[in-house]
């Protein structure tokens, strides 16, 4: 099968919405990039369509996507990082739509890990850490993290505090005692690179200790 | 204002190697590439090859790969191209030009540097 | 790699005439720009992305084309339009076709 569609399939798909959007990862695998696009509309027939990307590329013209379920795909080397390129839809050799894009401004970066909460008893308050992969990259070094944090009980009461290192300081006086929190932190690029916030982490639990009646303070776990 | 000042004309021998600069002034060095093309007497254009001067990543016309080698100085703001093992017919002027991001097309041109390679 | 082929090689024409500058791909090109080069100057971009002017360009020289088949026109020639014409891929490897020759008549 060609892949190239039949004039009736052609002007179908004319009246089609193929508004898309991409996000970059850099050095996602090792020194390999990732560009990702889906279709803004999820019930866009995607059988026969294809992406491209021409331009801003080293020593080659275009690349051809991946399909892989409803997401188009490419991991490469060979992206320039600078400049804007061509985007396309294509359904054989005919594009549909096409937009202009430079990679460095639409990147995702990947989801930090390892969050973890400690409590210290002395200082009364509690050490949030967290790591990143980004720490080791060449390209997308500096980010701009989130933290929220939420009593488990309260759905939709986030407190988000904005930082730039991998570690927080929350005081124990802020919370509430002997409450369970749920904590979940992301990130974005915040210098030359930009983009999207990244995926959540994986949440974190944690208890408040209770409050020590004599003096006030919260009890340890 | 935006600009691009080459180095002087060179006179090599074949076999030899020539490193050509190319300053630029009036903007962001990092923002744009950096392309080398050359141009033989009475003859067309020939795009040799680019730089990205943020992460010095290269791309090379297929012609000169082995032959050419791109790099950049950004503390100021210069980007060089050596030509490794001059034959006669690599006489030629060559140019630096800084090449739109968006369009991709050379806005700003260098004044050129003759390089004769001669026995 | 794809070739681009300008035709003519020379065109001879008067000051105030209309020129018709071709240029021809091997195979489809996105975007085609063009660049106006004197003797013994550095060329200058003068249509960028098939019909846009670079900076400074007047109005009487367009682009035009898609394809395969690309033309720059100057509309009414002046003295200083006499030069070497040079249309571009916008694409690695960045060709460039053979040049025209505007010359005065």
């Known amino acids: 099968e060609s892949g190239y569609a039949q004039n009736g399939d052609l002007e179908d798909a004319e009246l089609d919405d193929y508004s898309f959007s991409c996000y970059s990862q850099l050095e996602v695998n090792g020194s390999q990039h990732s560009l990702t696009c889906a279709f803004e509309d999820p019930d866009v027939n995607i059988t026969n369509l294809e992406f491209e990307i021409c331009g801003a590329l080293v020593e080659v013209k275009c690349l051809n996507f991946r399909k892989l379920q409803e997401i188009y795909f490419i991991e490469t080397k060979k992206f320039l990082l600078i400049g804007k390129s061509n985007i396309c839809v294509k359904v054989g050799e005919k594009s549909l739509t096409c937009k202009k894009i430079d990679l460095t401004t639409i990147v995702k970066p990947e989801a930090p890990f390892d969050l973890s909460v400690v409590y210290r008893e002395g200082a009364n308050d509690f050490v949030v850490t967290f790591n990143t992969s980004h720490l080791q990259k060449k390209y997308v070094k500096v980010l701009m993290h989130d933290v929220a944090y939420r009593q488990e009980k309260d759905e939709n009461k986030w407190t988000h505090v904005n930082l730039s290192s991998t570690k927080l300081t929350l005081l124990q006086r802020k919370l509430q005692p002997a409450a369970m929190y749920e904590i979940k932190v992301r990130s974005i690029p915040d210098h030359y690179f930009k983009g999207f916030w990244s995926e959540w982490s994986p949440s974190y639990y944690f208890r408040t200790p209770e409050i020590n009646n004599s003096s006030g303070e919260m009890d340890p776990i | 204002q935006v600009q691009l000042v080459q180095s002087g004309a060179e006179v090599k021998k074949p076999g030899a190697s020539v490193k050509v600069s190319c300053k630029a002034s009036g903007y962001t060095f990092t923002g744009y590439t950096m392309n080398w093309v050359r141009q033989a007497p009475g003859q067309g254009l020939e795009w040799m090859g680019l730089?990205?001067?943020?992460?010095?990543?290269?791309s090379y016309n297929q012609k000169f790969k082995g032959r050419v080698t791109l790099t950049r100085d950004t503390s100021i703001s210069t980007a060089y191209m050596e030509l490794s093992r001059l034959r006669s017919d690599d006489t030629a002027v060559y140019y630096c030009?800084?090449?739109?991001?968006?369009?991709?097309?050379?806005?700003?041109w260098g004044q050129g540097t003759t390089v004769t390679v001669s026995s | 790699e794809i070739v681009l082929t300008q035709s003519p090689a020379t065109l001879s024409l008067s000051p105030g005439e209309r020129a018709t500058l071709s240029c021809s791909a091997s195979s489809s090109v996105t975007y085609m720009h063009w660049y106006q080069q004197k003797p013994g100057q550095a060329p200058r971009p003068l249509i960028y992305?098939?019909?846009k002017l670079a900076s400074g360009i007047p109005a009487r020289f367009s682009g035009s084309g898609s394809g395969t088949d690309f033309t720059l026109t100057i509309s009414s020639l002046e003295p200083e339009d006499f030069a070497v014409y040079y249309c571009q891929e916008w694409n690695y490897p960045y060709t460039f076709g053979g040049g025209t020759k505007v010359e005065i008549k």
């Open positions: 730089i990205n001067p943020y992460n010095g990543v290269t």
């Open positions: 030009a800084r090449g739109d991001g968006e369009y991709w097309y050379f806005d700003v």
């Open positions: 992305e098939i019909s």
